[in-house]
Interface confidence: low
């Protein structure tokens, strides 16, 4: 009778992570009597995957009933495949011996390759806000993919960026890989509504790349421009002075009126108008009772935006042309907060 051969018909098997791998193995004879074992790798460091005789192998199931006397199919299934399962698997026939079974013949081996999808790219920006014309860095990370070949692209509002550096780790052979990329983006005043997108393409994604996004609204700070103007006289002794705060982002803003350096009123921007580019405008006004002043008045609109150092704009109010009323010592009318803002 011809000597037993162990046949592994598949040279290689490709399985997606999470699926079940079927590793086929058949013997050509029932003789000699003895169990089958499956190993990953060859040589003394090989790893036992399944032992027909003993042991507990919860991820492994046999394709056929190995307890049947005439069974010659020793194929196995390994469930819930991960990239760590990649390698060459050998089906090995043992001959019954005393005290231990003796290795008799091995199959040629089946190489299991695992395709694992990359995780959703995570894009993160700088910890602190930056102003227009500054360059900021964004990072993109994706993990757990196999094989190593992967493509990463950066976009800002649909326009592909070129200033970035990408690394795939580890450099050598591994069960799975990670990608890390850093892109540099120059901010403009119009970037409040802008998005930075990291796009990852991989063979497992079947042409449908994964994207991670970051909103530049979380990164940018657009400082305001200030304009102080004197409005026509509302009454004989009153002058209306307005402070236009334009094109700022984010909304967090505090405004202080100063009369000759003395604080007159402080208010926080609440009811603002939004511009098309996502920045905000706001206006505050101050009623000045000119009869309370003998000399010219220096009015200052001081703005603290998003915790930054204050910026200010001043206006000199000429009072000499106005008749002075005796007994009045109030310089500014502190109207109710709901009246302070035009918008």
């Amino acid at each position: 009778e011809e000597e037993l051969q162990v046949i592994q018909p598949d040279k290689s098997v490709l399985v997606a992570a999470g699926e079940t791998a079927t590793l086929r193995c058949t013997a050509t004879s029932l003789i000699p009597v003895g169990p089958i074992q499956w190993f990953r790798g060859a040589g003394p460091g090989r790893e036992l995957i399944y032992n027909q005789k003993e042991g507990h192998f919860p991820r492994v199931t046999t394709v056929s009933d190995l307890t049947k006397r005439n069974n010659m199919d020793f194929s196995i299934r390994i469930g819930n495949i991960t990239p760590a399962d990649a390698g060459t698997y050998y089906c090995v026939k043992f001959r019954k011996g005393s005290p231990d079974d003796v290795e008799f013949k091995s199959g040629a081996g089946t190489e299991l390759s695992v395709r694992a999808k990359p995780s959703a790219p995570v894009v993160s920006g700088p910890a602190a806000r930056a102003t227009p014309q500054h360059t900021v860095s964004f990072t993109c990370e994706s993990h757990g993919f196999s094989p190593r070949d992967i493509t990463l692209k950066w976009f800002k509002n649909g326009n592909e960026l070129s200033d970035f550096q990408t690394n795939v780790d580890p450099v050598g052979e591994s069960v799975s890989y990670s990608i890390h990329s850093t892109a540099k983006v120059v901010l403009t005043r119009e970037d409040v509504h802008s998005q930075v997108i990291c796009e990852v393409a991989h063979v497992t994604l079947q042409g449908d790349p994964l994207r991670g996004t970051a909103n530049l609204s979380e990164t940018i700070r657009v400082p305001p421009t200030l304009e102080v103007t004197q409005q026509p006289v509302r009454a004989e002794n009153q002058v209306n002075v307005t402070c236009q705060v334009r094109k700022f982002y984010p909304q967090r803003l505090q405004l202080t009126w100063l009369e000759n350096g003395n604080v007159s009123r402080t208010e926080t921007a609440s009811t603002v108008t939004e511009n098309k580019d996502g920045t905000y405008n706001w206006m505050s006004w101050l009623l000045v009772n000119v009869s309370a002043h003998r000399d010219d008045v220096k009015l200052t609109c001081q703005v603290e935006h998003d915790g930054q150092p204050a910026v200010s704009k001043s206006h000199d109010l000429k009072v000499s042309a106005h008749p002075k009323e005796q007994g009045s010592n109030t310089a500014a009318e502190n109207t109710g907060s709901n009246e302070r803002n035009i918008y």
């Epitope: 990953r40 790893e47 036992l48 995957i49 399944y50 042991g55 507990h56 192998f57 919860p58 991820r59 492994v60 390994i78 819930n80 991960t82 760590a84 399962d85 995780s119 993990h143 757990g144």
Partner: antibody, heavy 122, light 107 residues
Framework: EVQLLESGGGVVQPGRSLRLSCAAS????????MAWVRQAPGKGLEWVAV????????YYADSVKGRFTISRDNSKNTLYLQMNSLRAEDTAVYYC???????????????WGQGTLVTVSS | DIQMTQSPSSVSASVGDRVTITCRAS??????LAWYQQKPGKAPKLLIY???SLQSGVPSRFSGSGSGTDFTLTISSLQPEDFATYYC?????????FGGGTKVEIK
């Protein structure tokens, strides 16, 4: 950084119940088997239970079988151990650990949480 | 159940000494053995897996050997931070079992 944070320990009377939680962060929790291992005061390590990535199968030490239930919520990155009919001999520090699965099961435990003390006393 | 027997239960040694701890399984477990280090009040830390593979980040003075029933953990040159209790663990059969531990103390 991989972190496992156990909670829910405390003093409980014999026969009562307690539920331990283990909050995982810094790794893809749903990709790993998880285990509970305990250590009685001044004693060695004793494996308690293990659960596979998708919640099945589960295995228990004979000393806790029928009383303890291991479970996981992958959406919350949390491992649980429901302990019923507690006995004095269940007094121990309970550690949760990542079970490094290979082909034949959850072979090695790494990393481990800092542990939570369960004291069963009347 | 597989019994894991560690010896000695404690060992006194000095910095720079070579320390060997043995672990015997009540039946053959191939290479399915791990070694852990535990310091007082801390969680165990994996040192060696698959009998001889060094866990990432573990100093190379730690090494493991053995197969079947007899296993050895060797610390080639004991350092001050190595004074701790060491446990072996079999990982092929349920229930998973640990050795009783070996305490490495300062001489």
């Amino acid at each position: 950084e991989v972190q496992l944070l156990e909670s829910g320990g405390g003093v409980v009377q014999p026969g009562r119940s307690l539920r331990l939680s283990c909050a995982a962060s810094g790794f893809t929790f749903a990709h790993y088997g998880m285990a509970w291992v305990r250590q009685a005061p001044g004693k060695g390590l004793e494996w308690v239970a293990v659960i596979w990535v998708d919640g099945s199968p589960k295995y228990y030490a004979d000393s806790v079988k029928g009383r303890f239930t291991i479970s996981r919520d992958n959406s919350k990155n949390t491992l649980y151990l429901q302990m019923n009919s507690l006995r004095a001999e269940d007094t121990a520090v309970y550690y949760c650990a990542v079970a490094r699965e290979t082909y034949s099961g959850p072979n090695w435990f790494d990393p481990w949480g800092q542990g939570t003390l369960v004291t069963v006393s009347s | 159940d597989i019994q894991m027997t560690q010896s000695p239960s404690s060992v006194s040694a000095s910095v720079g000494d070579r320390v060997t701890i043995t672990c015997r399984a009540s039946q053959g477990i191939s290479s399915w053995l791990a070694w852990y280090q535990q310091k007082p009040g801390k969680a165990p830390k994996l040192l060696i897996y698959a009998a001889s593979s060094l866990q990432s980040g573990v100093p190379s003075r730690f090494s493991g050997s053995g197969s079947g029933t007899d296993f050895t953990l060797t610390i080639s040159s004991l350092q001050p931070e190595d004074f701790a209790t060491y446990y072996c663990q079999q990982a092929i059969y349920f229930p998973i079992t640990f050795g009783g531990g070996t305490k490495v103390e300062i001489k």
